[in-house]
């Protein structure tokens, strides 16, 4: 019986140019992950297998860091970054966990737009 | 539980549209997950078509996307597959499937054959 | 596109057989592996994904390993109603790709 829940980070904003860590935490249950997939709906960003330790998608190698711990850090956010993200638990003898985290990336703030193009 | 069932012509000419419609039961298509057209020509292997999200986003294969469309009705909790100028290539039976989020496929339509001949 | 290269494409076997069907990847797919079957006439059931993970209520008969390109999927002890089909595919990237197929036949 799965008794486990995932809490996320939500939905989380960030600016475009910058970064974000993506984190799942699976807590209620006494069982072993043993692998964590990070995957958007139509593609795998990374994997971390408690044996064979991680694997970064290579679409994305350039611009996501394992970690901290189980997460994932987006770096160089674009808004085509902008979507779902899910974190899928595998565990035993549970079986598998996901949690969802919605990414929203903005363009630099209004006030940084103005002062680049300002005048003296 | 989730249940997939696919409606459509069994007989399609050369040249026309292939529709074809699958109808969810138990899950509303609106709530969560993709929900996919994969195919599977007599005697061969599979084919994964594409996808349309609960959100409504798609998806589809590079090299079937010129005739493909996947679109829904979420007023009928269905979704559909249009595919146009087919051949006697494009004869297989068509499955409808739900993915979970990692990409691989619990739940499936039992399958219907669609023949393209004159 | 990653093309599932699966081996033997047919093999004859006898109940309480132990089976061994082998997948591999055009490149790494780490361990993003499913294992279907698939009877005459019925739409695939889902075994095995991520490469060993058993899905819900399948037999402990079945069971899947490897990373990287090479997959292995298992029947320890093959019963009656095992003489069917079976695929890999990968889900790693889009277009999600299957194996051409093995054919479990009656010795």
């Known amino acids: 019986m799965m008794t486990g829940t995932i809490e996320t980070t939500g939905n989380i904003s960030a600016e475009k140019g910058g970064s974000i860590i993506l984190q799942c935490h699976l807590s209620s249950t006494t069982a072993q992950v043993t692998q964590v997939n990070w995957e958007q709906q139509d593609q795998l960003l990374a994997i971390c297998n408690a044996d064979l330790g991680w694997h970064i998608s290579p679409s994305f190698k350039d611009r996501v860091a394992p970690g901290p711990g189980l997460g994932l850090t987006l770096q160089s956010l674009t808004v085509n970054d902008t979507g779902e993200y899910f974190c899928i638990y595998h565990t035993y003898p549970d079986g598998t966990y996901t949690g969802r985290i919605f990414l929203e990336v903005l363009e630099s703030s209004v006030a940084e737009h103005g002062a680049r193009f300002q005048i003296p | 539980q989730v249940q997939l069932q696919e409606s459509g012509p069994g007989l399609v000419k050369p040249s026309q549209t292939l529709s074809l419609t699958c109808t969810v039961s138990g899950y509303s298509i609106t709530s969560d997950y993709a929900w996919n057209w994969i195919r599977q020509p007599p005697g061969k292997g599979l084919e994964w078509i594409g996808y349309i999200s609960y959100s409504g986003n798609t998806r589809y294969n590079p090299s079937l996307k010129s005739r493909v469309t996947i679109s829904r009705d979420t007023s009928k909790n269905q979704f559909s597959l249009k595919f146009s100028s087919v051949t006697a290539a494009d004869t297989a039976v068509y499955y409808c499937?739900?993915?979970?989020?990692?990409?691989?496929?619990?739940?499936w339509g039992q399958g219907t054959l669609v023949t393209v001949s004159s | 596109d990653i093309q599932m290269t699966q081996s033997p494409s047919s093999l004859s076997t006898s109940v309480g057989d132990r089976v061994t069907i082998t997948c591999k990847a055009s490149?790494?797919?780490?361990?993003?592996v499913a294992w279907y079957q698939q009877k005459p006439g019925k739409a695939p059931k889902l075994l095995i994904y991520s490469a060993s993970y058993r899905y819900t209520g399948v037999p402990s008969r079945f069971s899947g390993s490897g990373s990287g390109t090479d997959f292995t999927f298992t029947i320890s002890s093959l019963q009656p109603e095992d003489f069917a089909t079976y695929y890999c595919q990968q889900h790693y990237s889009t277009p999600w790709t299957f194996g051409q197929g093995t054919r479990l036949e009656i010795k």
């Open positions: 499937s739900r993915k979970y989020y990692g990409s691989w496929f619990p739940y």
């Open positions: 490149q790494d797919v780490f361990t993003a």
